[in-house]
Interface confidence: low
């Protein structure tokens, strides 16, 4: 008799794929543009990335450090009107892209939360949550919560408002903290809160350390849903050298939880390569004309246009991973088991019941390595086969679809492999 199928977990929309942050509308659109109407024209691009949600803004009125001149219910006219926003929401909905609004109050000022007027600000946030929920947004983000006094209790209250409106609405909190204890204390009192932090930014780019950070986090958070990113707002290139971007993309898309990216992460956008551009929000490189300041500074392979035409580009890898993440049960909600594979390597299995299973092997080092996969670390339900098919490599040159002998697995410097194998009873 066939074994009984495992019951599927309840899946919210943010469980099904990546979130894409556009913190600075002007930098994202470039060319002196940067409004909601223009963003509407970029939704097809977001669809091509197969992201599930767009984290937008802040876009509300905020006069730097002036609480009286900060209105969370009003869109800054530089970004457009309420009508433009409604139109964007409608278009996004048609493309199955959810819109999450960033309500970090004093986003133009020194302290994001006007530290001396916390109660006034908290009331403004409450009113704003109710207003924008009625307007049809799918969730909210608040950042820099380490600057918010009594953050846990405020977050719990805002979560109640959000979830009270609909279980299908999401609250994201962001912190600059990388300290696990601080992160856990924020999560403890807030069930279902999605928290972005700098926790992984301190991974030191080594396999062992990354493995220990990931497993510690998953063990500490138990069975609650996580998000994965390297910070609450910044680009991956702020933390990683270019050669590790592919590896981290593969990892973020295949860990259990919601991957969260910033605009430009998909092309390896790097402020350091664009003189004069701010680290936190460099101009998005749509094509070679996107950064006219220094002629010749931008080559085709740095842009969306150039990378779209190259199947071996970072953007092409992002699209493939995003596609896999959104349709494979084992990656959507499968169990996770990390195991030893040798120094410099981080490897894990994702599996769900009788569905196709995935093996991820990541070489963080700058030397080629043979992987010594220690299957003895794995429970019986997640045993390794002798061979697995190569779904993709982060490096060019491997024949995709070919079976690889796991005992003889060799990885190039900074190479990540995504392998698949069937369930065997």
């Amino acid at each position: 008799r066939a074994p009984r199928c495992r019951e599927l977990p309840a899946q919210k929309w943010w469980h099904t794929g990546a979130l894409y942050r556009i913190g600075d509308l002007q930098a994202f659109q470039g060319h002196g543009a940067g409004n909601l109407a223009g963003l509407k024209g970029r939704l097809d691009y977001l669809s091509s990335l197969k992201v599930k949600g767009l984290v937008l803004g802040p876009i509300h009125k905020n006069q730097k450090d002036d609480v009286a001149q900060t209105d969370l219910l009003q869109i800054d006219p530089n970004f457009g009107s309420k009508e433009d926003f409604d139109s964007l929401l409608q278009s996004a909905k048609k493309k199955s892209i959810r819109v999450i609004l960033d309500l970090t109050p004093n986003y133009r000022g020194e302290n994001s939360w006007f530290s001396t007027q916390v109660d006034t600000v908290a009331t403004k946030v409450k009113d704003a949550l109710e207003f924008w929920l009625q307007a049809g947004v799918d969730g909210f983000q608040v950042r820099d919560i380490e600057n918010l006094k009594d953050a846990s209790s405020f977050l719990a209250e805002w979560q109640n408002i959000t979830k009270g409106f609909s279980e299908d609405r999401l609250l994201i909190a962001g912190t600059n903290s990388s300290d696990l204890q601080q992160i856990l204390s924020l999560l403890e009192s807030n069930k279902d809160l999605l928290l972005t932090s700098s926790y992984l930014s301190d991974s030191g780019s080594t396999g062992e350390h990354t493995k220990s950070l990931v497993t510690q986090y998953l063990n500490a958070t138990g069975n609650r849903w996580c998000s994965w990113s390297l910070s609450q707002a910044r680009l991956l290139t702020s933390f990683l050298p270019a050669q590790l971007l592919r590896l981290y993309q593969l990892m973020l898309f295949t860990l259990p939880g919601t991957p969260v990216f910033s605009y430009g992460d998909e092309i390896g956008l790097d402020a350091a390569a664009l003189p004069g551009q701010p680290m936190e929000a460099p101009v998005m490189l749509w094509d070679e004309s996107s950064f006219p300041d220094i002629p010749g500074a931008v080559s085709a392979n740095m842009t969306v246009k150039g990378q779209s035409e190259d199947p071996g580009s970072l953007l092409s890898l992002f699209r493939r991973l995003s596609d896999q993440r959104s349709k494979e049960r084992s990656l959507l909600h499968g169990d996770f088991h990390a195991f030893s594979a040798g120094p410099g390597l981080f490897s894990y299995i994702r599996h769900w019941d009788q569905n196709e299973r995935f093996l991820v092997v990541l070489n963080f080092g700058d030397v080629g390595l043979s992987a010594g996969l220690q299957a003895s670390d794995l429970p019986a339900s997640a045993s390794l086969p002798a061979k697995a098919d190569l779904l993709l490599s982060t490096q060019p040159g491997r024949e995709e679809g070919s079976p690889l002998e796991l005992e003889r697995l060799k990885l190039e410097p900074h190479e990540g492999l995504l392998l698949r194998f069937p369930y065997a009873a």
Partner: antibody, heavy 114, light 107 residues
Framework: QVQLEESGPGLVATSQSLSITCTVS????????VHWVRQPQGKGLEWLGV???????IYNSGLMSRLSISKDNSKSQVFLKKNSLQTDDTAMYYC????????SSYAMDYWSQG | DIQMTQSPASLSASVGETVTITCRAS??????LTWYQQKPGKSPQLLVY???TLADGVPSRFSGSGSGTQYSLKINSLQPEDFGSYYC?????????FGGGTKLEIK
């Protein structure tokens, strides 16, 4: 092993141009950035600029107008050119490897003798 | 531009002692801090990168720590070969400025 070796004139007249060549071995300029740093006698280090593997150059904004960095990947050479020299440009000039495709990307891990 | 303030500017200590050199950045540099050692007449040598990772071949008596804007380099049980100048440098954004240096001399 990794080496960086400079060649150029020891002496340049005021208001003339300085050209220094840094020839590297043991690594490829398509994989690593090269930084330029200078140090006046008895003083501290000053970062001048960098040329990344993809050829993009970034300069110290205070010196940008008189500075240019270029390279020839095939010859494993990086060039520093500085126009209209003043007496306060007198210093030891170093080239150093940085942006290596490896764990020490955010550092200059090998330096020339200057 | 981020400014790096190093202290002390000079320091004299005896072999076997422990010394600490500090570096303060004018903005958050998120651990993108590097330490170098320079002996008279020689080029600088990498000691520590990303605030606390020891470069290859650097003795374990050296250690880096810190976060945000405050960083330090500690040398336990000073050896004769440790005397010279020490510089910090940030790699958060360009220009990648250096601290003013700390001259460590034998007492």
């Amino acid at each position: 092993q990794v080496q960086l070796e400079e060649s150029g004139p020891g002496l340049v007249a005021t208001s003339q141009s300085l050209s220094i060549t840094c020839t590297v071995s043991g690594f490829s300029l398509t994989n690593c950035g090269v930084h330029w740093v200078r140090q006046p006698q008895g003083k501290g280090l000053e970062w001048l600029g960098v040329i990344w593997p993809n050829g993009i150059t970034i300069y110290n904004s205070g010196l940008m107008s008189r500075l240019s960095i270029s390279k020839d990947n095939s010859k494993s050479q990086v060039f520093l050119k500085k126009n209209s020299l003043q007496t306060d440009d007198t210093a030891m000039y170093y080239c150093a490897r940085g942006g290596h495709y490896g764990s020490s990307s955010y550092a200059m891990d090998y330096w020339s003798q200057g | 531009d981020i400014q790096m303030t190093q202290s002390p500017a000079s320091l004299s200590a005896s072999v076997g002692e422990t010394v600490t050199i500090t570096c303060r950045a004018s903005g958050n540099i998120h651990n993108y801090l590097t330490w170098y050692q320079q002996k008279p007449g020689k080029s600088p040598q990498l000691l520590v990168y990303t605030a606390k990772t020891l470069a290859d071949g650097v003795p374990s008596r050296f250690s880096g720590s810190g976060s945000g804007t405050q960083y330090s380099l500690k040398i336990n049980s000073l050896q004769p070969e440790d005397f010279g100048s020490y510089y910090c440098q940030h790699f958060w954004n360009t220009p990648y400025t250096f601290g003013g240096g700390t001259k460590l001399e034998i007492k």
